[in-house]
């Protein structure tokens, strides 16, 4: 089948990095500067992505692969292939329509992105608060008051933070 296909379609012999040039009797021509073809048999080369403005070049375009972008310092990538850049905030903040705002009391964010999440409710698991929460850190739950017998000193990490609006499973 491959042999038949190549006899019928000379373009199928054109490798990645080239295109089948109809203007030159279907000769395989190299992709022009700032363009690429990542698969064989293509009749055109694709224009390379340009990482401009808030986007930085992570990987240069080549004749066989597109450029890859990331974001300038102070921003992070969003979307497939870093299609957008979103500004960072400080830990203890979240990004809102009004810019970076401190987490409300009872919530925290330990990253430069994402939303403030509620502190873990230790009492739901029958535990007590060992270390208070802050804007940047979740509470640390300790043993329940009943467990605080002589010699007992187990400390468990907090349960995974739940997203606001999601009830416990």
């Amino acid at each position: 089948f491959e042999r038949t296909r190549s006899l019928q379609d000379p373009c199928s012999n054109c490798p990645a990095g080239t295109f089948c040039d109809n203007n030159r009797n279907q000769i395989c021509s190299p992709c022009p500067p700032n363009s690429f073809s990542s698969a064989g048999g293509q009749r055109t080369c694709d224009i390379c992505r340009q990482c401009k403005g808030v986007f930085r070049t992570r990987k240069e375009c080549s004749s066989t692969s597109n450029a890859e972008c990331d974001c300038t310092p102070g921003f992070h990538c969003l979307g497939a292939g870093c299609s957008m850049c979103e500004q960072d905030c400080k830990q203890g903040q979240e990004l809102t329509k009004k810019g970076c705002k401190d987490c409300c009391f009872g919530t925290f964010n330990d990253q430069k992105r994402g939303i403030c999440r509620p502190w873990t409710n230790c009492s739901l698991d029958g535990k007590s608060v060992l270390v208070n929460g802050t804007k940047e850190r979740d509470v640390v739950c300790g043993p329940s008051p009943a467990d605080l017998s002589p010699g007992a000193s187990s400390v468990t990490p907090p349960a995974p933070a739940r997203e606001p609006g999601h009830s416990p499973q």
């Epitope: 808030v54 969003l78 979307g79 957008m84 850049c85 979103e86 990004l95 329509k97």
Partner: nanobody
Framework: EVQLVESGGGLVQPGGSLRLSCAAS????????MTWFRQAPGKGLEWVAH????????YYVDSVKGRFTISRDNAKNSLYLQMNSLRAEDTAVYYC????????????????WGQGTTVTVSS
């Protein structure tokens, strides 16, 4: 080609005013939130203001509230930043940027960026 081109920057004395413009082309301007950022010499990029698709919502960084006004003219595919009572600390390159799809609902990511226009506030 999707493009944003800023203009209107220049040298102005403290207390003076400037109006920046951003001409958009190659996309449906009225379908996107639009944003102004700035970068002072030796500093990182700072968000300044943004405006909803129809102009009904506008938000500003605290340092420019009451002095700067963001606006848009969807018929002219243009974004503006009126800058009054300018201070030395407003000296920066100002960039307009397009909010990506879903902006303000699920994220505040921008996907298209202008080349910038320089504002210098000095006596």
């Amino acid at each position: 080609e999707v493009q944003l081109v800023e203009s209107g920057g220049g040298l102005v004395q403290p207390g003076g005013s400037l109006r920046l413009s951003c001409a958009a082309s190659g996309f449906t301007f009225s379908s996107h939130w639009m944003t102004w950022f700035r970068q002072a010499p030796g500093k990182g990029l700072e968000w300044v203001a943004h405006i909803k698709e129809d102009g009904s919502e506008k938000y500003y960084v605290d340092s420019v509230k009451g002095r700067f006004t963001i606006s848009r003219d969807n018929a002219k595919n243009s974004l503006y930043l009126q800058m009054n009572s300018l201070r030395a600390e407003d000296t920066a390159v100002y960039y307009c940027a397009r909010g990506g799809e879903g902006y303000s609902d699920s994220h505040f990511g921008v996907d298209v960026w202008g080349q910038g226009t320089t504002v210098t506030v000095s006596s």
